[in-house]
């Protein structure tokens, strides 16, 4: 019979004959032969292959490097490769999320618009008139300045953006 | 490898500007923040803020908010650190660190004088 | 921002012997998550900063093992077993727990 150009799925060709291709998880040790199947092995531990595959080493696990501020998200296991995400109160520098940068804290002044996740940062916005924040925070919003008239009293000095109103007592001694 | 190559020295007149570079090598640039650090002739050091080469974003010491601006060119896989409005408090060797601190420039000496 | 202290300027040592660096902190170096972000460099005369210790007590790669690190919230020492001629320079400690990151003014280890 006429040798083939092509194989099936999860086949491949070679020595013009098809074979089967490894399973995820597993490594190619040697081709099929005539009388013999594809001989595969198990990949070891830390190694993973995802896709059937002719490969005769299998990859190594992904390290999620603690000093580049990772933990590991998901184990790896034979058939996938670990999954890294960064620290609580970190978040990733890039998409590839290869090392992770701690989140902002908004100045005295500012407030959190948006509270950073594993993957964005924090997003600050200016304290607007009647609001105020006077501390650096990372999850803070800006405050409004307290209301003296509601508690019956008058401003004795007015807020900014970094510090509260201050409500004194109603002057009784009017002419 | 990795390495960091910083420019070189620089003799600046007071109330002028300064820009230096960090072109970066051995590793995907827009993995990691730039860190720029100053340091004194006989001092310690000083963190200035860092940019990240990903977004563009950067984040400042307040303390040199206005003095320093970083920048990077993802193309060019370099960062820089513009410094204004230069005075003799300005001198000094900046150093520019990955990420993780784990690799550093050889440093950028500038000198304010008139 | 955090004050990062490290009280003596110089700590002289006979090559062989043993010596502990210390370093405090203004406020605690501990994240709500759980880890503590301290690192400890080495300047060598004339040369760049270099990493030796991550996270109060992680060695860094390529790092001699004669160096060691350990503490916990505000109090931390850097620890050189054996030190040799080539241990000569300024130590740093450095928090990165909160904006800005900050240095302490440095330990400058010489040979007796």
């Known amino acids: 019979p006429e040798p083939p150009t092509a194989c099936r799925e999860k086949q491949y060709l070679i020595n013009s004959q098809c074979c089967s291709l490894c399973q995820p998880g597993q490594k190619l040790v040697s081709d099929c032969t005539e009388f013999t199947e594809t001989e595969c092995l198990p990949c070891g531990e830390s190694e993973f292959l995802d896709t059937w595959n002719r490969e005769t080493h299998c990859h190594q696990h992904k390290y999620c490097d603690p000093n580049l501020g990772l933990r590991v998200q998901q184990k790896g296991t034979s058939e996938t490769d670990t999954i890294c995400t960064c620290e609580e109160g970190w978040h990733c520098t890039s998409e590839a999320c290869e090392s992770c940068v701690l989140h902002r804290s908004c100045s005295p002044g500012f407030g959190v618009k948006q509270i950073a996740t594993g993957v964005s940062d924090t997003i600050c916005e200016p304290c607007p008139v009647g609001f105020f924040s006077n501390v650096s925070s990372a999850f803070e919003k800006c405050h409004p300045w307290t209301s003296c008239e509601t508690k019956d009293l008058v401003v004795q000095q007015a807020g900014t953006n970094k510090t509260d109103v201050v409500c004194g007592p109603q002057d009784r001694l009017r002419a | 490898e990795v390495q960091l190559q910083q420019s070189g020295p620089e003799l600046v007149k007071p109330g002028a500007s300064v820009k230096m570079s960090c072109k970066a090598s051995?590793?995907?640039?827009?993995?990691?923040?730039m860190y720029w650090v100053k340091q004194k002739p006989g001092q310690g050091l000083e963190w200035i803020g860092y940019v990240n080469p990903y977004n563009d974003g950067t984040n400042y010491n307040e303390k040199f908010k206005g003095k320093a601006t970083l920048t990077s060119d993802k193309s060019s896989s370099t960062a820089y650190m513009e410094l204004s409005s230069l005075t003799s408090e300005d001198s000094a060797v900046y150093y520019c660190?990955?990420?993780?601190?784990?690799?550093w420039g050889q440093g950028t000496s500038v000198t304010v004088s008139s | 921002d955090i004050v990062m202290t490290q009280a003596a300027p110089s700590v002289p040592v006979t090559p062989g012997e043993s010596v502990s660096i210390s370093c405090r902190s203004s406020k605690s170096l501990l994240h709500s998550q759980g880890n503590t972000y301290l690192y400890w460099f080495l300047q060598r005369p004339g040369q760049s900063p270099q990493i030796l210790i991550y996270?109060?007590?992680n060695l860094a790669s390529g790092v001699p093992d004669r160096f060691s690190g350990s503490g916990s919230g505000t109090a931390f020492t850097l620890r050189i077993s054996r030190v040799e001629a080539e241990d000569v320079g300024v130590y740093y400690c450095m928090q990165h727990v909160e904006y800005p990151f900050t240095f302490g003014s440095g330990t400058k280890l010489e040979i007796k």
């Open positions: 996270r109060v007590s």
């Open positions: 051995g590793y995907t640039f827009t993995s990691y923040v």
């Open positions: 660190a990955r990420g993780a601190m784990d690799y």
